[in-house]
Interface confidence: low
């Protein structure tokens, strides 16, 4: 939906416009941008008051607003991926038109940390409360809305347009109507200040078409930082009214002649300007010629003035305006220097923190220090960084390489390590054999055992080759079955790997392994990894033996 300008307030060198209309923050910014502005900044209490005034104007005219709470976009946003910074007044948000972090803020509530999506700020107006100056609109952050679906709670937005300067409103000395058209396409008949390059149409008379006179003026820069309409004397003057109508349009005094004519005059200490209407102080500082925080200092005999800047600022080429001194040019910091209005601050690169000898010094952050290590197992601190390592039997894993994942030796790149059954464990593995076979002393091979229906052989002994050095994973105990399988595999050479061929009699019943003695008598049915017997169930951590099974349907289970 579109947005209509409902209200405008011009003050200092800026105009603020308030608009109603349900738009996303991007659409609102685009609307402001089309007319040469941006979503409004609220960089100080004074600016917050100007914005509140324009919203007050809008709400006065917007009878349709029924919601108790109203929200209006301003130009404060945080990009996707940029995280909250609780130490800053703007909490990591920044003004859309650019500019440094500003000290003023008025957050509605504490912000939740989220870096996932773009966040935008709106002014929250509680319409059940009067718009009193002591009750400035709070800042509310949230999703930025999307075109066509901006969220039903956002009622509008506020734009800001900046100008070189302003003209005083035109003064009428008799009945008439002034209509100002601003460079940002707003028309108004009442502005406290009228922005540079605005047009003014003056229709004199009391509405009677025959008597109406029209005048057209443009707000121009007459001299550096001096803006006026180029009009001379009050407009729409009428002998019928003399000084009685709007003080004759005069800024201060109005002096009537006997014939109904009149002249404007000024009080002591003031002088009449070229427009013959406006009075200006004879004190050169009274017109506030100094800008940007500069202080006006009167010269000898009050005849001229100089501008003086606060610490951290210097006069620009005009000698009227203060500009920030870039202290970072002198490289006062060990790593990163951020220039700020009136000063600077030192920052450290990622992996470093403020500290060490000297002002602005940085020292390495020991990421591996007790209680702060990001690594699952081993951590090695380096200058400005760190790296993680894993114990034997584990490899680095995770997106950031801080986690450790068990190596499944039973499916290793070199093929199975066991001749027959292979049992993977956390950080290790062990071998086993099919019924009728026993594990050789090397812990890998299987040899034909006595023709008894025994269970698959359990894990190797401590010195056996299958156990990895340094593993802390509990070992499974050899188990005795209550009954063996109904048949035995075909006779094969003692060192060969017997295959689980389709005619093998073991397919008629599942292989089982009893829980180790001392453990609860629980049957578990692990699955076999591969088509060959050289794989086996993963042994759960904690020492419970799993039971190797071949599925009754002849297919292998999945680990």
């Amino acid at each position: 939906t579109g947005a209509d300008t409902e209200a405008v307030v011009c003050v200092g060198t800026a105009c603020y416009t308030a608009h109603s209309g349900k738009l996303s923050a991007a659409e609102a910014q685009n609307h402001c941008n089309q007319n040469g502005g941006n979503l409004a900044t609220v960089k100080s209490k004074e600016e917050a008051q100007h914005v509140q005034r324009v919203l007050a104007q809008l709400l006065r005219r917007e009878a349709a607003l029924t919601a108790r709470m109203s929200k209006f976009w301003i130009g404060l946003q945080r990009e996707k991926g940029k995280c909250l910074d609780p130490s800053l007044p703007l909490k990591g948000f920044s003004w859309v038109g650019g500019g440094e972090d500003t000290p003023y803020s008025n957050w509605h509530k504490e912000l939740r940390n989220s870096c996932i999506s773009k966040r935008c700020v709106s002014l929250l107006l509680d319409l059940s409360q009067p718009l009193l100056p002591s009750r400035l609109p709070k800042w509310s952050e949230g999703p930025c809305g999307s075109p066509g679906s901006p969220g039903s709670n956002i009622e509008g937005f506020v734009c800001k347009f900046s100008f070189k300067g302003m003209c005083r409103p035109l003064a009428l000395g008799g009945p008439g109507q002034v209509t100002y058209t601003t460079p940002f396409q707003t028309t108004s008949s009442s502005l406290e200040a009228v922005p540079f390059a605005s047009a003014a149409n003056v229709a004199c008379g009391e509405g009677d078409k025959d008597e109406t006179q029209s005048h057209y003026f443009l707000c121009k820069e007459k001299a550096p930082d001096v803006f006026d309409w180029g009009s001379s004397g009050p407009l729409c003057v009428s002998p019928k009214y003399g000084c009685n109508f709007n003080n004759g349009g005069c800024h201060q005094d109005c002096f009537e002649g006997g014939d109904g004519s009149f002249l404007c005059g000024c009080r002591p200490g003031f002088r009449l300007l070229d427009d013959l209407v406006t009075c200006a102080s004879r004190n050169p500082c009274s017109s506030s010629p100094c800008r940007g925080g500069a202080t006006c200092v009167l010269g000898p005999h009050g005849k001229n003035y100089t501008c003086r800047c606060p610490q951290g600022y210097q006069l620009d080429s005009s000698q009227l305006d203060c500009v920030d001194v870039d202290e970072c040019q002198d490289s006062p910091c060990a790593q990163e220097c951020v220039n700020t209005p009136g000063g600077f601050r030192c920052e450290c690169w990622v992996g470093y923190e403020p500290g060490g000898p000297g002002e602005g010094a940085c020292q390495d952050v020991d990421e591996c220090a007790l209680g702060r290590s990001p690594c699952a197992q081993g951590c090695t601190n380096t200058d400005g960084s760190f790296h993680c390592s894993c114990e034997e039997g584990y490899v680095l894993a995770g997106e950031d390489g801080t986690q450790c994942q068990d190596v499944d030796e039973c499916v290793g790149p070199g093929g199975p390590l066991c001749d027959s059954l292979c049992f993977n464990t956390q950080g290790s593995f062990h071998c086993g054999c099919l019924p009728g076979w026993v594990l050789a002393p090397n812990g890998v091979s299987c040899t034909m055992g006595p023709v008894s229906l025994g269970p698959p052989s359990g894990p190797p002994d401590e010195e056996d080759k299958g156990e990895k050095e340094g593993s802390t994973v509990p070992r499974a105990a050899t188990a005795s079955p209550t009954r063996g399988p109904e048949g035995t595999p075909k006779a094969t050479p003692t060192t060969s790997r017997p295959s689980l061929s389709s005619d093998a009699p073991i397919t008629s019943a599942p292989l089982k392994m009893l829980a180790p003695s001392g453990s609860p008598g629980v049957w578990r049915e692990p699955s076999i990894h591969h088509a060959t017997a050289a794989s086996g169930p993963q042994e759960p951590a904690g020492g419970d033996s799993s039971v190797a099974t071949q599925n009754n349907d002849g297919t292998d289970g999945q680990k």
Partner: antibody, heavy 120, light 111 residues
Framework: QVQLQQSGAEVKKPGASVKVSCKAS????????MHWVRQAPGQGLEWIGE????????YYNQKFKGRVTMTRDKSTSTVYMQLSSLTSEDTAVYYC?????????????WGAGTTVTVSS | DIVMTQSPDSLAVSLGERATINCKAS??????????LNWYQQKPGQPPKLLIY???NLESGVPDRFSGSGSGTDFTLTISSLQAEDVAVYYC?????????FGGGTKVEIK
């Protein structure tokens, strides 16, 4: 010229309600807030509340909440103030006064006042 | 609520002499460089009339013998040269916070 014309004096019994009117003329009715202020005999001024004639928003002094209702009729540029559950302490002159919309809401134009007497 | 305390309760001044009325707020009524403090004059049988707004701004049509000053919590209304028509009760009022509150009034008479 700007004027606020109030309704005539009222005599009410305790527990009853009174509705006082204030008709605005000489200015744009919806561009100013309308306030109600009362003054008990020999006493000072007490703000009751305000109404925005544009959107009909009302803000009341907590002291009167639940007893006061302010309404407006845009077609006749009239604002009404109704006070219920009257007691003898509500005997006062009730004034309507306008203020600018924002900021320093000083009362630049006042009605002549309506005397409300609560007596059994 | 902000309590507005006026002093004195009554004041008798000779014609042509200066009259000074004080008003003290229980908390500051200043905001962004402005004082949200207004003065009214009430004559017997009439509604109050605005004299001064924002502590020191003279309302249109009010004689310039009336002036206001002060900021924060302490404010003063001065009548530089008392005239017979100035006999009235004067009230201060704050409009910075709800509820809008008035002082108890100061009665000015001719000595």
């Amino acid at each position: 010229q700007v004027q606020l014309q109030q309704s005539g004096a009222e005599v009410k019994k305790p527990g009853a309600s009174v509705k006082v009117s204030c008709k605005a003329s000489g200015y744009t009715f919806t561009s100013y807030w309308m306030h109600w202020v009362r003054q008990a005999p020999g006493q000072g001024l007490e703000w009751i509340g305000e109404i925005d004639p544009s959107a009909s928003y009302t803000y009341y002094n907590q002291k009167f909440k639940g007893r006061v209702t302010m309404t407006r009729d845009k077609s006749t540029s009239t604002v009404y103030m109704q006070l219920s559950s009257l007691t003898s302490e509500d005997t006062a002159v009730y004034y309507c006064a306008r203020s600018v919309y924002y900021g320093n809401k000083y009362f630049d134009v006042w009605g002549a006042g309506t005397t409300v007497t609560v007596s059994s | 609520d902000i309590v507005m305390t006026q002093s004195p309760d009554s004041l008798a001044v000779s014609l042509g002499e200066r009259a000074t009325i004080n008003c003290k707020a229980s908390q500051s009524v200043d905001y962004a460089g402005d004082s949200y403090l207004n003065w009214y004059q009430q004559k017997p049988g009439q509604p109050p009339k605005l004299l001064i707004y924002a502590a020191s701004n003279l309302e249109s049509g009010v004689p310039d013998r009336f002036s206001g000053s002060g900021s924060g919590t302490d404010f003063t209304l001065t009548i530089s040269s008392l005239q017979a028509e100035d006999v009235a009760v004067y009230y201060c009022q704050q409009t910075n916070e709800d509820p809008r509150t008035f002082g108890g009034g100061t009665k000015v008479e001719i000595k």
